[in-house]
Interface confidence: low
């Protein structure tokens, strides 16, 4: 029998054989961390000769070469050091911005042993555009330097680097770039499991939250799937079992898929799982049309019954056919449910492709993806209804370009990964959905549709009132805690008489809750600076109320996201190691940040939070207020850095009874509270007959209107002290 020669050692590395020295066997080289094999593999041909992929000569000497990370091609509005052609593992590159520009991202990045830079792309931004400066990742070249609504930027990679992410991005109306950040990588680079798990988990958790943002099933319920919402998820698991996948690796593919299924079923979402193995042809082991696809035991059992030998007669990798079988399944389900029905249109679809190589038969898999996108009517509005995760395993023949082409492109998310081996894959699936702490009360979800009620649009909004008249507003920040202003309680009257009115789907009047305890900031004292001629001072104007019972989460009652928490990090789709400072840089990233508060009548009103130099000019106006501050010499005595400032130009001003309400912004269709309404120089409700009418200040008013809101980024120690076991805070 023919066999291939055995003189294939690699200096400094090792190799494995998929099927011994026989024809069809794949020889895979590996090197110690920080080195990569060249070539990566060889195939034993039927002629008894080794063939090296993409090699000109039949047998080149295999060597372990040092991994290097790509150099910046250009860095705008700043400098980087040192300037090298490429960087060795462990090497650092540092970034600094010119005056007037703020550094976003990582000031220092280190080259990691997988050929990838740690940290995030450094960008020097002045906050001038409609969208933030999208930056230029290391090794990339960008064309396009306008960041207005509708502007496009294009990226390409230098020399032999491969682009993953979006080659073209557009600045959208919501101030966010379309697609996902492009990254230029060495063809031999791969991802570490500890990076993939949170990236995959964040994206997946966001999808789960959108499917059905309710509590995680308690283990004691025996994983009973509670089918109680209209949201439904179809999960399609595609497992490569072509010849180049060893039987052992196929077992790990199966095990990883089982882990995934197990986790998915632990969420209270309606889910159907399809399982397809593929080589030259696909084999559907479980279809979403089968009622058993909703039953964890049936799904796991069909996974366990998947046989490596199922595909022994066809050993190619036909990714097109695998994805096409998903398309056919979708088509059948659409016929069954009816194309125009909500039942069909409300299903979210997630495809996870586990492969060890690029497709080598059956045509371009991209064609099947295009068909899938078309049948699901995926457009900007329905982008959340499809997620395709393309995971390459083994650094062999995995084609970055193809994986990138197949994976979804969503801002702040990654859907295409290459892992070093199946062990790494197993680690990823073990850790990716470990978000049990985060899904209980998914935060910052408001109904944005035109026919939603005010309370459905801002379900965190609550009214705080004594037995007599309404006094203050507040925001649910968990299912039992409300954040509000301390000055609402300055008369110190008995809190047992107070009530908190929370939204309730059953009643247009909401539901009343008693207050179990009020935690008022000890630093708040409205008369603290009376002897300095400052008649009222609102520093530390913050309070927390613990409700006597937990609020049942609903369309009308749901917490807002508090920045600097893991819950908000998930909603922002930021990487796991993010800090509080990262959140501040992302949310308050311009000199004028559009934000909102809720009016007495429940409607959402617009303001602009002034930052940097604009904050100074916004606050300076206070010196013109001679009644409250007769002999004020330093504005900062009154407007400390605890306050955000609004009230310029076309801003609405809050009324007296709106104190304590959230000052919030929208990012990625989620809402984040950055401040709370504290005090101002003008009350638009004064003298108006009802709560629907507000009077704008006359242009000639001295001082002009200004409003000051407690900045939650400046109250972190206090918030952490009292909410440490309620929310999961990030490092500062």
């Amino acid at each position: 029998a023919t066999s291939c020669p055995q003189n294939v050692n690699i200096s400094g590395g090792t190799f494995t054989l998929s099927h011994g020295w026989a024809p069809g066997s794949l020889l895979i080289y590996s090197c110690p961390q920080g080195l990569y094999p060249s070539p990566a593999s060889r195939l034993c041909k039927s002629s008894g000769q080794w063939q090296t992929p993409r090699a000109t000569r039949s047998l080149t000497k295999a060597v372990c070469k040092p991994v290097r990370c790509p150099a910046p091609v250009s860095f705008e509005n700043g400098i980087y050091t040192p300037r090298l052609g490429s960087y060795p593992v462990g090497g650092n590159v540092s970034f600094e911005c010119e005056d007037g520009f703020i550094l976003r991202g990582s000031p220092v990045r280190q080259c990691r042993p997988n050929g990838m830079w740690d940290g995030e792309t450094a960008v020097c931004d002045n906050g001038a555009g409609h969208c933030p400066n999208p930056g230029i990742s290391l090794g990339a070249v960008r064309t396009g330097s306008r960041f207005g609504h509708g502007d496009k930027v294009r990226y390409r990679c230098s020399s032999n680097l491969v682009l993953t992410g979006s080659a073209e991005r557009e600045c959208q109306g919501n101030g966010v770039w379309s697609g996902t950040e492009p990254i230029c990588r060495q063809p031999y680079s791969y991802d570490f499991p500890e990076d993939v798990a949170p990236a995959l988990g964040t994206s997946f958790s966001h999808m789960l939250g959108a499917t059905n943002p309710t509590q995680r099933t308690k283990e004691s319920l025996g994983r009973k799937i509670q089918i109680q919402r209209s949201g439904h998820l179809n999960l399609y698991l595609l497992l490569d079992s072509s010849q180049s996948v060893s039987e052992n690796d196929f077992l790990i593919f199966k095990e990883s898929a089982s882990l995934m299924v197990d986790r998915i079923f632990s969420f209270e979402i309606n889910v159907s799982v399809a399982i397809i193995t593929f080589a030259s042809e696909p084999k559907v082991l479980m279809s979403v049309l089968n009622v058993n696809s909703r039953d964890i035991t049936e799904v796991i059992s069909s996974l366990e019954n998947a046989k490596y030998k199922d595909h022994e007669n066809g050993t190619g990798t036909n990714t097109y056919a695998a994805l096409n079988s998903v398309y056919l399944m979708m088509n059948n389900q659409m016929q069954l449910l009816g194309m125009k029905t909500m039942a069909w249109q409300e299903i979210r679809h997630a495809i996870i492709l586990l492969t060890d190589g690029k497709s080598n038969m059956g045509g371009s898999p991209k064609t099947a993806v295009d068909q899938i996108r078309e049948i699901l009517n995926i457009n900007q509005k329905r982008n959340d209804y499809l997620d395709i995760y393309a995971i390459g395993v083994g650094k062999l023949d995995v084609d970055w370009r193809e994986l990138n082409e197949l994976g979804s492109k969503k801002d702040g998310e990654r859907h295409a990964f290459i892992l070093q081996d199946t062990k790494a894959l197993h680690q990823v699936f073990e850790h990716m959905l470990d978000v049990s702490k985060l899904t209980d009360t998914i935060c910052g979800v408001g109904n944005m549709s035109a026919n939603a009620s005010d309370q459905e649009r801002t379900p965190w909004h609550v009214t705080i009132k004594p037995k007599s008249q309404e006094t203050c507003r507040g925001a649910l920040i968990s299912d039992q805690w409300v954040l509000t202003a301390a000055h609402c309680f300055r008369d110190g009257n008995d809190h047992s008489l107070w009530r908190v009115n929370v939204g309730d789907p059953k009643s247009q009047w909401g539901k009343e809750f008693l207050i179990e305890k009020a935690v008022i900031s000890p630093g708040f004292d409205v008369f603290a600076k009376k002897n300095q001629g400052i008649l009222e001072f609102y520093g530390d104007d913050i309070a927390l109320l613990k409700l006597a019972q937990k609020v049942k989460m609903s369309t009308h009652a749901r917490p807002i996201c508090l920045p600097c928490t893991m819950e908000a990090n998930l909603a922002l789709r930021r990487p796991q190691g993010s800090t509080c400072r990262d959140h501040e840089n992302e949310l308050l990233n311009k000199q004028s940040v559009p934000a909102h508060f809720v009016a007495l009548n429940g409607s959402k009103l617009n303001i602009n939070l002034k930052m940097g130099v604009e904050w100074t000019s916004c606050a300076e106006v206070v010196s013109q207020e001679k009644t409250m501050f007769p002999n004020l010499t330093d504005v900062r005595e009154v407007v400390t850095d605890q306050f955000l400032c609004s009230g310029t130009q076309e801003d609405e001003s809050p009324c007296k009874g709106e104190s304590g309400g959230a000052v919030f912004l929208e990012r990625r269709f989620r809402f984040f509270q950055v401040g709370l309404v504290s005090w101002g120089l003008y009350n638009p409700c004064l003298g108006s007959a009802d709560k629907n009418s507000r009077k704008r200040a006359p242009r000639s008013k001295v001082p002009p209107p200004r409003d000051f809101h407690i900045n939650l980024f400046r109250m972190q120690p206090w918030l952490r002290q009292h909410l440490g076991d309620v929310l999961n805070f990030l490092p500062l």
Epitope: P522, T579, P717, Q721, G724, P731, L732
Partner: antibody
Framework: QVQLVQSGAEVKKPGASVKVSCKAS????????MYWVRQAPGQGLEWMGI????????TYAQKFQDRVTMTRDASTTTVYMELSSLRSEDTAVYYC????????????WGQGTLVTVSS | SYELTQPPSVSLSPGQTASITCSGD??????TCWYQQKPGQSPVLVIY???KRPSGIPERFSGSNSGNTATLTISGTQAMDEADYYC?????????FGGGTKLTVL
């Protein structure tokens, strides 16, 4: 497993400075804060300050504000505490301790570094 | 500045229940942690967030906190529990330790 390994004992003269290192391993360095606490012979624990390994931001106890500097090197997962203008009452064991958030406490401590200030 | 007060010493026989108190102004509104320190060793966290036990700490250690006083309770005290115990809380952004209590098991 989590380990915080501190540098060895130091003997310093009054007016000098000392720099103590604390090498962290076995966990995600940037997810946890690092605190410094000291203990004079036969005395109680005294908090000196905190450093955020991810960004390097610090908060010092009022008492040490002018004399202490805490830094970190994320590439080697090491934090440093430098105390200047040493006096004899600074003779103490200096501990680094890891903590997730204030209310979670300092869940892992280094073995301590004895600093002796003597003329 | 904020202060925490602990009794300097507590003595009891093995098997008895030890209660070590820690008092401070409105301490019940703050979270308290407790540390055990044996001679020549680094401190060990035994209670965090008033009453939670880190993994590896025996169930006989418990904590409570209300009003102006936090209490560490060790039920069925053993000879190995003989050590110094420190309470700790946060005031604004500063950690504050109590003076420590020497627990002697006779």
């Amino acid at each position: 497993q989590v380990q915080l390994v501190q540098s060895g004992a130091e003997v310093k003269k009054p007016g000098a400075s000392v720099k103590v290192s604390c090498k962290a391993s076995g966990y995600s360095f940037t997810t946890y804060y690092m605190y410094w606490v000291r203990q004079a012979p036969g005395q109680g624990l005294e908090w000196m300050g905190i450093i955020t390994p991810s960004g390097g931001s610090t908060t010092y106890a009022q008492k040490f504000q002018d004399r202490v500097t805490m830094t970190r090197d994320a590439s080697t997962t090491t934090v440093y505490m430098e105390l200047s203008s040493l006096r004899s009452e600074d003779t103490a064991v200096y501990y680094c301790a890891r903590g997730y958030e204030g209310s979670y406490g300092f869940d892992h401590w280094g073995q301590g570094t004895l600093v002796t200030v003597s003329s | 500045s904020y202060e925490l007060t602990q009794p300097p010493s507590v003595s009891l026989s093995p098997g008895q229940t030890a209660s070590i108190t820690c008092s401070g102004d409105k301490l019940g509104n703050k979270y308290t942690c407790w540390y055990q320190q044996k001679p020549g060793q680094s401190p060990v966290l035994v209670i965090y967030q008033d009453n939670k036990r880190p993994s590896g700490i025996p169930e006989r250690f418990s904590g409570s906190n209300s009003g102006n006083t936090a209490t560490l309770t060790i039920s069925g005290t053993q000879a190995m529990d003989e050590a110094d115990y420190y309470c700790q809380t946060w005031d604004s952004s500063t950690a504050v330790f109590g003076g420590g209590t020497k627990l002697t098991v006779l």
